[in-house]
């Protein structure tokens, strides 16, 4: 749906089109539930609420209201060269039965978040890919995105900032003649587990199954994409636990070291996988030392004390170099009782849609 | 009509440090970049650095990072550019320019000659 | 810094000719492309913004195209007034103008 925010002269300073989908989880007297739902197709612009920002004083934003009282608010800043969705809140009302049955709770709610959507002043921002902005217990994914604050005009400008999910990785380039063809794409990898203790117990609950996706360049420069199991059989898992930071360190092989950092939102009581590291060797590559590191993610997210589950693929990106594919993921951080998983807040793609 | 009223021309001498100013009308101040923009003989147009008023972000070009110092006053709507350890290469008019949104650089202020002798 | 190669960087014709000034940018610049015209003794003038589009009360005698890294700009039917430098500027990251081309009549 596309929704305009215009300034005292009728000029749009804000157009955004979307469609949105929630990931809520909400206690019921049975226990912790989840709940999926979209951006209804009469959700509307609070015109009162949403602005182009005043001289001076305060930035645009765009709050969108659907259902029995609940709002979504796009908050805009920029800089001399960008501008970004600076932040992002949702205020739901648990007392709409129609959208959380059973609730325990009748409050009104409010999440927010930071977001990485951001764009070159005098661009709109585009995502066909989900964006995913990861709240207290809410989950909001924007497809097919565009977005476009400080307008000059009434319509959205010629260039566009692309988000990072729609960048084209670097093209497989097929090898030459005399080189060995890329490794046939390998089976989905085996699922283990995995756990880290310290002095005060178990600080870290993971199963997973972990492909590598590199692309990197070869000898013969060429640029080769290949994909790489994990092979629990083969891989010894140590790592730490610490109040604000949880490692799980994996070595494979003898030639490979991959390092997850899980970190937590003392506000929010979330956990969520903050880093990856990755040391390989990769004998036919150029530079066969394969060193790539992303300390600022935003995946894996659960509340502290839960267990964050998604049984389809999920892929994170560290680098154009280097994308993690995880299968059947169950984790948990920080706060492990009994050495067993908590309650389980799905991903997004798993939940069940009304 | 939006206009950049730009102050008056300097001599200064080699190693010194000026400061011009640039006041704005005509528009919402704070809504969009003010550039500067140095002309010179032997360079041609050279852009230095924008400034938005809104929040003080300035970006520079390489060249220029280490010599100009972009500033803002929102109360009085002017932009202020200090240029340091002036030397002969640094005569020049300088001009600030705002964009018209993707438009480029579409309003300019009269220029502000600067000559570095000693 | 985007690098703006600009040349040439002088030319000469005749009135009621054509000129063409060529512009390569250092990496794709998706049609953030202005040119000015500058006088002495005057500012700079925006003649085209966008790779192609006129400003309002410019004559339909400059023309401008390109896409990706090279950029043209032309004025036809050459007339006195058109003596100046001309300079092309990229705002697609941050901004950056040519070396100029100063045009004399013959």
């Known amino acids: 749906a596309m929704f305009m925010v215009k300034n005292g002269n009728g000029t749009a300073c804000i157009m955004a089109n979307f469609s949105a989908a929630f990931s809520v989880n909400y206690d019921t007297k049975s226990g912790p539930k989840n709940m999926t739902f979209d951006l209804p197709s009469d959700a509307t612009v609070v015109l009162n609420r949403s602005s182009c920002g005043k001289e001076n004083t305060s930035d645009p934003s765009l709050v969108i209201a659907f259902g029995r009282g609940h709002t979504l608010t796009l908050n805009f800043t920029r800089n001399a060269t960008r501008y970004s969705v600076q932040l992002m809140s949702f205020v739901y009302n648990l007392s709409d039965t129609h959208l959380f049955p059973n609730a325990s709770s009748k409050e009104i709610k409010t999440v927010e978040s930071i977001t990485d959507i951001r764009a070159d002043i005098d661009k709109k921002y585009r995502c066909v890919s989900g964006t995913q902005v990861h709240m207290n217990n809410v989950t909001v994914t924007l497809h097919d995105a565009t977005i476009q604050a400080y307008l000059s005009n009434s319509s959205f400008s010629r260039g566009e900032t692309r988000c990072e999910q729609d960048r084209p990785s670097p093209t497989t380039a097929p090898p030459a003649p005399p080189s060995p063809s890329p490794s046939p794409v390998p089976k989905s990898p085996s699922v283990d587990k995995y756990n880290v203790s310290g002095t005060n117990g178990t600080c870290l609950l993971a199963s997973m199954g972990l492909q590598l996706n590199l692309t990197y360049e070869r000898k013969d420069n060429t640029t080769v994409t290949r994909l790489l199991n994990i092979n629990p059989n083969k891989t010894s898992a140590s790592g730490s636990c610490g109040a604000h930071l949880v490692t799980l360190e994996l070595h494979s092989e003898g030639t490979t070291v991959l390092l997850f950092q899980f970190g937590m939102n003392a506000s929010s009581s979330r956990f969520f996988l903050q880093g990856i590291q990755l040391n390989t060797i990769l004998p036919d590559a150029l530079v066969p030392t394969f060193s790539i590191s992303n300390h600022s993610l935003k995946a894996l997210q659960a509340t502290v004390g839960n267990s964050y589950k998604c049984n389809t693929e999920e892929h994170i990106f560290v680098s154009k170099m280097l994308s993690l594919n995880v299968f059947s993921v169950q984790v948990q951080a920080f706060k492990v009782d009994s050495d067993r998983f908590g309650s389980v807040e799905e991903c997004v793609q798993d939940g069940n849609s009304m | 009509q939006v206009q950049l009223q730009q102050s008056g021309a300097e001599l200064v001498k080699p190693g010194a440090s000026v400061k011009m100013s640039c006041k704005a009308s005509?528009?919402?101040?704070?809504?969009?970049?003010i550039h500067w923009v140095k002309k010179s003989p032997g360079q041609g147009l050279e852009w230095i650095g924008a400034?938005?008023?809104?929040?003080?972000?300035?970006p520079y070009s390489q060249k220029f990072k280490d010599k100009a110092t972009l500033t803002a006053d929102k109360s009085s709507s002017t932009t202020y550019m200090q240029l340091s350890r002036l030397t002969s290469e640094d005569s020049a008019v300088y001009y600030c320019v705002r964009a018209n949104w993707d438009v480029a650089f579409a309003y300019w202020g009269q220029g502000t000659l600067v000559s570095v002798s000693a | 810094d985007i690098q703006m190669t600009q040349s040439p960087p002088s030319l000469s014709a005749s009135l009621g000719g054509k000129v063409t000034i060529t512009c390569k940018a250092s990496q794709d610049i998706d049609r953030y492309m202005a040119w000015y015209q500058d006088k002495p003794g005057k500012g700079p003038r925006l003649l085209i913004h966008d790779t192609s589009t006129l400003q309002p009360g410019i004559p339909s005698r400059f023309s401008g195209s390109g896409s990706g890294r090279d950029y043209s700009f032309s004025i036809s039917n050459l007339e006195p007034e058109d003596i100046a430098t001309y300079y092309c500027l990229q705002y697609d990251n941050l901004w950056t103008f040519g070396g100029g081309t100063k045009l004399e009549i013959k």
């Open positions: 400034i938005y008023p809104g929040n003080g972000d300035a």
């Open positions: 005509g528009y919402i101040f704070t809504n969009y970049n």
